[in-house]
């Protein structure tokens, strides 16, 4: 039986009965918030073999092992993850071991096992046999291994039953509990699963199978399941569904999303039955189950019941997320806010058409209107008194409307009005008249030449760069010394720079009047020698990264024809030099024969240039005679050969803080103080833990349904 679409068992342990007939949970399984310690021994679900999304366990009192509950759970597919994880075991106060002895494969995602004070048998599981990459696993804050004394079956009797693998240079037995080994398939099976008797399964099987080389005997499928068979792809006239099975058109045509209160059915796209058309596609008509590409952003019409939508906060802007056509009027009144420009762009940046008018008033937090980055048409079907369809009044910090070199905006009907915008140059308004096609519609008083731009540098001279030099993490630039009519009016220069992967940034990107600014700023004093050109060394930059840079002269407010004179440069794009890449990630090696090693790795996180090739070096290691002098059946850990590397194991320091030998020097010493990098890493780690815990709480604590 397929159960789903995600099972949430909370508060009452008897809800576990819902799992009674499940063989596959199509979705997630949550078992959480059961605060009364219960006896779970009577609950056993041997039929459950697959969870298609993730398994989350959180604060279940009295549960000591998962092995009795789910003795045959073989695969967690991770089709959807919980914060990047397919298995989360968090704050399970009584859990002593995981015990999922039949768990063979976590197809996607990592594991997070954290804050389980009594949990052992963690170091005895080789997760690399279950997951593709173990580097993202997070196993922290459980019972210390030294207090666990984990023993695999048969070890004490000196008749070990489990197989050994190496983890972190430690060659040891692998088991889930004191009486359950971790199953490993013969090397002859390669990546294939195997039966209990170590016979290789069919290549389409995942996890395990009941008979060898038979695609109808799989416990789970590597790719897709259809009519009792594991198949590499869905057959004709069937469609992939929920990442693991094939369904027919009729099935797909009759299902609805349970997450929505509308009855917009599923669609078929690219061989998959899915809830929505993917990004960039739209349904091909109201009765259609198929998707067609959108021309440009996909249209989404939004309507305001009261006709006029007031945007006075990020929250009110949020309602317009994804809207491309707004039926009604926009009244923008943003007096304050944090990171307001980028937040508004996030929520309003797709709007292309406003059917009514746009009014911007008392928006002292705005420096630019570029957050409406796709607005191309104001229809003016409804206008303000006086026939205005674009109205800009009393915005103390507004300096730019849009970047008119890259903007095509039409105002179909109605006039424009501008007053009391002291930093908005009249030339900017006149430019808008030309672009929008409203020139000639405005009467004399509609654009006030005295109180618009009265406090701005409206007559700007251009500063020219004279030289640029780059290294891997530095840029040196110089520019012509600006000479205003009265040299005493020049105070200094400000250099603005930021990462710019594309050559499409403007001065006002991400900038608002409340201190948020996507540009880094550096002040540059005037060189004392009048003949020396001003310049700056920008350091601490990333290698092989394109930066945008511009310079502004800081001048006294020298009034000339009622306006201030200033100077600034064009935006210059400049790339730092390439550098050595960071190390390749997740290096794994395995032997597939007596004369071959297969080595796999992921690209470096910081390529610092265009990667052209990798260098793989290897060398033969002498067999370590030390390994033969140890009794492998003893409970002790296998001693690992230590190399003097000038650092000390922190755990050893706590035991005997005064007698450790530091590096090559004799004599007692204490743990070395943490470096800045280590402190930073610890801080980030703590932050990451908090973020996850918040995510967990926000996801699982939900209002009681009505």
């Amino acid at each position: 039986e397929i159960c789903g679409p995600g099972i949430d068992i909370r508060n009452d342990y008897q809800q576990l009965k819902r799992l009674e007939n499940c063989t596959v949970i199509e979705g997630y399984l949550h078992i959480l918030l059961i605060s009364k310690a219960e006896d779970y021994r009577s609950y056993r679900f041997p039929k459950l073999t697959v969870i298609t999304e993730y398994l989350l366990l959180f604060r279940v009192a009295g549960l000591e092992s998962l092995g009795d509950l789910f003795p045959n759970l073989t695969v967690i597919r991770g089709w959807k993850l919980f914060y990047n994880y397919a298995l989360v075991i968090f704050e399970m106060t009584n859990l002593k071991d995981i015990g999922l002895y039949n768990l063979r494969n976590i197809t996607r995602g990592a594991i997070r096992i954290e804050k389980n004070a009594d949990l052992c048998y963690l170091s005895t599981v080789d997760w690399s046999l279950i997951l593709d990459a173990v580097s993202n696993n997070y196993i922290v804050g459980n019972k210390p291994p030294k207090e666990c004394g984990d023993l695999c079956p048969g070890t004490m009797e000196e008749k070990p039953m489990c197989e050994k693998t190496t983890i972190n240079n430690e060659y040891n037995y692998r088991c889930w509990t004191t009486n359950r080994c971790q199953k490993m398939c013969p090397s002859t099976c390669g990546k294939r699963a195997c039966t209990e008797n170590n016979e290789c399964c069919h290549p389409e099987c995942l996890g395990s199978c009941s008979a060898p080389d038979n695609d109808t005997a799989c416990v789970a499928c590597r790719h897709y399941y259809y009519a009792g068979v594991c198949v590499p792809a869905c057959p004709p006239n069937t469609y992939r569904f929920e990442g693991w099975r094939c369904v027919d058109r009729d099935f797909c045509a009759n299902i609805l999303s349970a997450e929505s209160s509308d009855s917009e059915g599923f669609v078929i796209h690219d061989g998959e039955c899915m809830q929505e058309c993917p990004s960039g596609f739209i349904r091909n008509g109201s009765q259609s189950m198929y998707c067609i590409p959108c021309e440009g952003p996909c249209p989404k019409v939004c309507e305001e019941e009261k006709k006029t939508k007031t945007i006075d906060s990020v929250t009110s802007a949020q309602m317009l997320q994804g809207c491309t056509i707004f039926k009604g009027n926009l009244l923008i009144n943003i007096r304050r806010g944090n990171n307001i420009a980028s937040e508004l762009e996030n929520f309003m940046g797709l709007i292309e058409v406003v059917t009514g008018y746009v009014k911007i008033r008392h928006s002292h937090a705005l420096v630019s209107l570029s957050f409406l980055k796709n607005l191309r048409l104001i229809l003016g079907e409804e206008q303000l008194e006086g026939n205005y369809s674009f109205y800009v009044l009393d915005n103390q910090n507004l300096q730019q409307l849009w970047d008119w070199d890259h903007r095509n905006l039409t105002i179909k009907a109605g006039k424009m009005y501008f007053a009391f915008n002291p930093k908005l140059c009249v030339s900017e308004i006149y430019r808008m008249e030309e672009v929008t096609g409203t020139k000639g519609r405005q009467s004399k008083g509609d654009i006030n030449t005295r109180n618009n731009g009265e406090r701005a540098s409206c007559e700007s001279d251009v500063l020219h760069f004279t030289s640029t030099t780059t290294s891997k993490n530095r840029i040196i630039i110089t520019w012509h010394r600006y000479r205003p009519p009265d040299y005493r009016d020049l105070i200094s220069f400000t250099v603005y720079y930021k990462e710019a992967p594309f050559k499409n940034v403007t001065e006002y990107d991400g900038q608002d009047a409340c201190g948020s600014n996507s540009w880094n700023m550096v002040d540059v004093d005037l060189p004392p020698n009048k003949d020396v050109e001003p310049g700056i060394l920008l350091h601490g930059l990333k290698p092989w990264t394109q930066y945008a840079v511009y310079v502004k002269a800081v001048t006294l407010t020298m009034v000339e024809n009622d306006h201030i004179r200033g100077a600034k440069s064009e935006i210059l794009y400049i790339r730092t030099n390439a550098s050595v890449p960071s190390i390749p990630l997740d290096v794994l090696s395995a032997s597939n024969s007596s004369s071959q090693l297969i080595v796999k790795w992921n690209p470096p996180s910081l390529p610092n240039g265009n990667l052209s090739y990798y260098i793989v070096r290897w060398q033969r290691q002498p067999q370590d005679g030390y390994l033969y002098r140890h009794n492998y059946c003893s409970k002790d850990k296998i001693p690992i050969r230590k190399y003097a590397d000038g650092t000390i194991d922190i755990e050893e320091v706590t035991e005997n803080p005064k007698t450790e030998v530091c590096g090559g020097e004799k004599g007692p010493c204490c743990a070395c103080p943490k470096t800045e990098a280590e402190k930073q890493a610890e801080k980030e780690e703590a932050e990451y833990r908090k973020v996850f815990e918040n995510f967990l709480h926000n996801s699982i604590f939900v209002p009681r349904p009505e």
């Epitope: 679409p5 209160s261 059915g265």
Partner: nanobody
Framework: QVQLVESGGGLVQAGGSLRLSCTAS????????MAWFRQAPGKEREGVSA????????YYADSVKGRFTISRDNAKNTLYLQMDALKPEDTAMYYC?????????????????????WGQGTQVTVSS
């Protein structure tokens, strides 16, 4: 408080027509999917037809395809079911239902669990 009131039921001869209406109040009608269900004496409640809010996409049970038509008027907050070529087996109590969010995943349009609000029903009797 959400309220759904069905009307338009009655006694009709086989082959005849009826038009059921369901007027909703207490909700933003234009954002909810809606459906008609029916329950004959001694039988399970079954889905007859459903309609989405945004696009007007429609769904029909095989037994009524080609005979029944579902529609809605968002301005009037009303859902309709036009029933033609009625058969005696269409005799049942007809209920109007409104979708609700119901956790994760999916369900079939004719599953009652996907609907959060229900009307009192209107009786349709088809005589032979």
């Amino acid at each position: 408080q959400v309220q759904l009131v069905e009307s338009g039921g009655g006694l009709v001869q086989a082959g005849g027509s009826l038009r059921l209406s369901c007027t909703a109040s207490g909700l933003t009608f234009g954002t909810f999917g809606m459906a008609w269900f029916r329950q004959a004496p001694g039988k399970e409640r079954e889905g007859v037809s459903a309609i989405s809010a945004s696009s007007g996409r429609t769904y029909y049970a095989d037994s009524v395809k080609g005979r029944f038509t579902i529609s809605r008027d968002n301005a009037k907050n009303t859902l309709y079911l036009q029933m033609d070529a009625l058969k005696p087996e269409d005799t049942a109590m007809y209920y109007c239902a409104v979708r609700s969010k119901n956790g994760a995943g999916y369900g079939f349009w004719y599953e009652a669990r996907l609907y959060g609000y229900w009307g009192q029903g209107t009786q349709v009797t088809v005589s032979s």
